[in-house]
Interface confidence: medium
C-alpha cells in the first residue's frame, strides 16, 4: 500500500481511474475526496479546491462515503405494533421492526413498513407452519387422532390421551375423557409450543470498502459519469 | 508476480519493419492500459504508445503516429508493437510498461528489448 | 528538449538531502495531473518510485518523497546512501499532446 496519499483534487490520466473514496466530478474534470459517512458536501470541488464536508443535520443521515449535497432523511418514528431496532444517527437510518406476535407484511429495505399480528390457529386447528420475522402462521385442521383446544399462534395439534376405558372420546378441539382408571398419552401431557419468531436482524454495518469491479481502464477523458447519489455510491 | 518480457528486437535497416512482443504474466492483463517507452543510447525515457485494457482505445507520440501500431491479444496475455518505415531515429531500448490502474504511472517495467535502424 | 524540464545533474554527500525538481506547464502538471517518478540504476529498466505526486509504492524507502506545487514537482531524497546514484525521471501526462511526457532526467551522483 502507499505509504502517503496523494493530495485531490487531481486529473486521472487516461487508463487510470480515481481511488477508493474519491470520485470523478464532471464539471471540474478532476478526481475529489468523497464525503465520509456522516457528512455530506457543502461546497463541490473546483479544479484548485478539494470538496468541502459538512456534518449531517438533526434527523438526517448518510450512510456511505457520498458527495451528495444534502443528507437523507431519517424514516418517521417507529408505530406502536413495532419496535426501534437501530436509532436514528448521522451515520444510519433509523430500523423499525415488529414486536413479539406480529410479522412483517410489507418490508422496506431496512426493517418494515408494515406489520400484522400473527394468525391464531381456532380450536380444531394447529399451527402448520410458524410464523417468522416476514411470515405469518399457516394453520392445518387437526388429523383424526389429534386435537387442538386453544386459539393460538404457537400450538401444533396434539395426540388425544390413550384411555384405558374412553369416557368421551376426542374430537379435533377437544381431549379424550377417560374414565377413572389412569390414562397414558403417547406424548407428554400439556400443550406444545412452538417457539415465537425472535428478531434475528443484525445491526446493518458498513460494508468492507474494497472496489467491486475492475477499475475502468479506458483511456477516454473526460472519465465516465458516476451517479452523485449517496445511497448507490460504494467506498 | 507480475513480469513482463519484451521479445523481437534487432537490427533492421532504414525503411523496414520489426514487430515487437510483450508476454505478460502475473496479473489481470485486461485490467491494465499498456505502454511502450523507449530509450536511446545514452538518452532520456520517450513514451511512445498506449493502449487500453480492452484495446479498444490507442494513443502514439507525434513522432512515431502513421508509422507504429500498438495491439492486443488478450488471450495471449500478449501486447504487441508494429513498427513500419523504421529511421535511425527509432535505434532504442524499447520497453514494454503496465499503468497502475489508480492515480497513474507505470508500475512494473520490462527488461526492455534493443531495435537497431542502420543500414 | 523535454516537455518537462528536470536539471541534467546533483550531487550530494552521503547521509545528506537532495533534492530534483521537474516543472512543467497548464497542460500537465499544472492541469492537475499527476507526476510520477522514476529511478534508472545503470543497465536496468526504470523503476517507479513515486506516484500521483507523493505515493510511495510498497518498497520504496520513505527516504524518498514527492512534492507538488502548480506547474512543478520535485522528488527530495533524505539520507543519501551510495546505491542512491542513477538516473531520476519525472512523468506525467500532458492534454495538449495527448500523451505521456518525460523529464529529461537527471544523473544523481553521490560524492
Known amino acids: 500500500l502507499p505509504a502517503q496519499v496523494a493530495f485531490t483534487p487531481y486529473a486521472p490520466e487516461p487508463g487510470s481511474t480515481c481511488r477508493l473514496r474519491e470520485y470523478y466530478d464532471q464539471t471540474a474534470q478532476m478526481c475529489c475526496s468523497k464525503c465520509s459517512p456522516g457528512q455530506h458536501a457543502k461546497v463541490f470541488c473546483t479544479k484548485t479546491s478539494d470538496t468541502v464536508c459538512d456534518s449531517c443535520e438533526d434527523s438526517t443521515y448518510t450512510q456511505l462515503w457520498n458527495w451528495v449535497p444534502e443528507c437523507l432523511s431519517c424514516g418517521s418514528r417507529c408505530s406502536s405494533d413495532q419496535v426501534e431496532t437501530q436509532a436514528c444517527t448521522r451515520e444510519q437510518n433509523r430500523i423499525c421492526t415488529c414486536r413479539p406476535g406480529w410479522y412483517c407484511a410489507l418490508s422496506k429495505q431496512e426493517g418494515c413498513r408494515l406489520c400484522a399480528p400473527l394468525r391464531k390457529c381456532r380450536p380444531g386447528f394447529g399451527v402448520a407452519r410458524p410464523g417468522t420475522e416476514t411470515s405469518d402462521v399457516v394453520c392445518k385442521p387437526c388429523a383424526p387422532g389429534t386435537f387442538s383446544n386453544t386459539t393460538s399462534s404457537t400450538d401444533i395439534c396434539r395426540p388425544h390421551q390413550i384411555c384405558n376405558v374412553v369416557a368421551i372420546p376426542g374430537n379435533a378441539s377437544m381431549d379424550a375423557v377417560c374414565t377413572s382408571t389412569s390414562p397414558t398419552r403417547s406424548m407428554a401431557p400439556g400443550a406444545v409450543h412452538l417457539p415465537q419468531p425472535v428478531s434475528t436482524r443484525s445491526q446493518h454495518t458498513q460494508p468492507t470498502p474494497e472496489p467491486s469491479t475492475a477499475p475502468s481502464t479506458s483511456f477516454l477523458l473526460p472519465m465516465g459519469p458516476s451517479p452523485p447519489a449517496e445511497g448507490s455510491t460504494g467506498d | 508476480q507480475v513480469q513482463l518480457l519484451e521479445s523481437g528486437g534487432g537490427l533492421v535497416q532504414p525503411g523496414g519493419s520489426l514487430r515487437l512482443s510483450c508476454a505478460a504474466s502475473?496479473?489481470?492483463?485486461?485490467?491494465?492500459?499498456m505502454t511502450w517507452v523507449r530509450q536511446a543510447p545514452g538518452k532520456g525515457l520517450e513514451w511512445v504508445s498506449g493502449i487500453s485494457g480492452g484495446g479498444a482505445a490507442t494513443f502514439y507520440a507525434d513522432s512515431v503516429k502513421g508509422r507504429f501500431t500498438i495491439s492486443r491479444d488478450n488471450s495471449k496475455n500478449t501486447l504487441y508493437l508494429q513498427m513500419n518505415s523504421l529511421r535511425a531515429e527509432d535505434t532504442a531500448v524499447y520497453y514494454c510498461?503496465?499503468?497502475?490502474?489508480?492515480?497513474?504511472?507505470?508500475?512494473?517495467w520490462g527488461q526492455g528489448t534493443l531495435v537497431t535502424v542502420s543500414s | 528538449q523535454s516537455v518537462l524540464t528536470q536539471p541534467p545533474s546533483v550531487s550530494g554527500a552521503p547521509g545528506q538531502r537532495v533534492t530534483i525538481s521537474c516543472t512543467g506547464s497548464s497542460s500537465n502538471i499544472g492541469a492537475g495531473y499527476g507526476v510520477h517518478w522514476y529511478q534508472q540504476l545503470p543497465g536496468t529498466a526504470p523503476k517507479l518510485l513515486i506516484h500521483?505526486?507523493?505515493n510511495r509504492p510498497s518498497g520504496v524507502p520513505d527516504r524518498f518523497s514527492g512534492f507538488k506545487s502548480g506547474t512543478s514537482a520535485s522528488l527530495a531524497i533524505t539520507g543519501l546512501q551510495a546505491e542512491d546514484e542513477a538516473d531520476y525521471y519525472c512523468q506525467s501526462y500532458d492534454s495538449s499532446l495527448s500523451g505521456w511526457v518525460f523529464g529529461g532526467g537527471t544523473k544523481l551522483t553521490v560524492l
Open positions: 500521483g505526486n507523493t
Open positions: 502475473g496479473f489481470s492483463f485486461t485490467s491494465y492500459a
Open positions: 510498461a503496465r499503468q497502475s490502474q489508480y492515480v497513474g504511472g507505470f508500475d512494473y
